[in-house]
């Protein structure tokens, strides 16, 4: 079996203030079972912006039905952007872990860059 | 951590209904599968049913579909197994389990509840 | 429906040998590319336990003595190096369509 590859096909995406932004990402296997999660920027200091696993995230929906068999697209969509939304998405994928998840492989970035309103 | 835990052991007389609850923690309720396993003392394990609580897709195992129904409380992570017209035959542990690859799995167990039939 | 068929039913092995458990589907459950066959432990008294996922994958935190393999109609589990603690009965089960179980095959020390 191929080791699994995280794809995130856009490397930008340019979003007007107030609009919805489309971040795409697919994984090429269902091997590791685990959850996917965002992040904006990267390192330590990344900032979770949907963990698939757990938590709260009223401005994001997935593009898929994530419950549904054979299911490997987990883009999301970010609603009202705003300038402070702007920098490099990253898709990754963890593997099931006990007592954690760990994280096993991310994808090559998206940066997303706000066109201001017209005023 | 994930925890599924269930409602405790219940004794009933034939053609009595039985319902048994399994709460979930510690992960998003409404991004997984629970499926609902039987087993009889001493016996295998039978599988009766499945239930997406995104939007309460079930599949059934043909032998428990006109007695057995699935919901879902998603404000309480809460999943319910309902068993109607019980027979002696019933008598066993009923397990919860959570699929976290969306493959028709179980990858998370509840400790099981055990349900007695008996006049 | 797949009718899954495990055999032996039950098997004796020496602490420190080989176990291998069998499980026959009655007919192919490969699909999309994956063999959609699992196995699960199950020790007295405890909900089983995932071992192996799509029939080759050992699960998280499952010692590297257990492996899976076969593809199509037949699998096997397999323990390089019997422990105590894998006294136990084993589940295999399918998903190529709605899941069903083996009817278990029951570990011992020899």
């Known amino acids: 079996e191929e080791e699994l590859q995280v794809i995130q096909p856009d490397k930008s995406v340019l979003v007007a203030a107030g609009e919805t932004a489309t971040l795409r990402c697919t994984a090429t296997s269902l091997i590791p079972v685990g959850p996917i999660q965002w992040f904006r920027g990267a390192g330590p200091g990344r900032e979770l912006i949907y963990n698939q696993k757990e938590g709260h995230f009223p401005r994001v929906t997935t593009v898929s039905d994530l419950t549904k068999r054979n299911n490997m697209d987990f883009s999301i969509r970010i609603g009202n952007i705003t300038p402070a939304d702007a920098g490099t998405y990253y898709c990754v994928k963890f593997r099931k872990g006990s007592p954690d998840d760990v994280e096993f492989k991310s994808g090559a970035g998206t940066e997303l860059s706000v066109r201001a309103k017209p005023s | 951590q994930v925890q599924l835990v269930q409602s405790g052991a219940e004794v009933k007389k034939p053609g009595a209904s039985v319902k048994v609850s399994c709460k979930a923690s510690?992960?998003?309720?409404?991004?997984?599968?629970i499926n609902w396993v039987r087993q009889a003392p001493g016996q295998g394990l039978e599988w009766i049913a499945m239930?997406?609580?995104?939007?309460?897709?079930?599949h059934y195992n043909q032998i428990f579909k006109d007695r057995a129904t699935l919901t879902t409380d998603t404000s309480t992570s809460t999943a319910y197994m309902e068993l109607r017209s019980l027979r002696s035959d019933d008598t066993a542990v009923y397990y919860c389990?959570?699929?976290?690859?969306?493959?028709?799995?179980?990858?998370?167990w509840g400790r099981g509840t055990l349900v007695t039939v008996s006049s | 429906d797949i009718v899954l068929t495990q055999s032996p039913d039950s098997l004796a092995v020496s602490l420190g040998e080989r176990a291998t458990i069998n499980c026959r589907a009655s007919?192919?459950?490969?699909?999309?590319?994956?063999?959609?066959i699992f196995w699960y432990q199950q020790k007295p008294g405890q909900p089983p336990k995932l071992l192996i996922y799509?029939?080759?994958n050992r699960d998280s935190g499952v010692p590297d003595r257990f492996s899976g393999s076969g593809s199509g109609t037949d699998f096997t589990l397999t323990i390089s190096s019997l422990q105590a603690e894998d006294v136990a009965v084993y589940y295999c089960?399918?998903?190529?369509?709605?899941?069903?179980f083996g009817q278990g095959t029951k570990l011992e020390i020899k």
């Open positions: 007919k192919s459950v490969s699909s999309s590319g994956y063999n959609w």
């Open positions: 799509l029939a080759s």
């Open positions: 089960q399918e998903s190529r369509e709605l899941p069903t």
């Open positions: 239930i997406d609580p995104s939007d309460s897709e079930t």
């Open positions: 389990a959570m699929d976290y690859g969306s493959l028709y799995a179980m990858d998370y």
């Open positions: 510690g992960y998003t309720f409404t991004n997984y599968w």
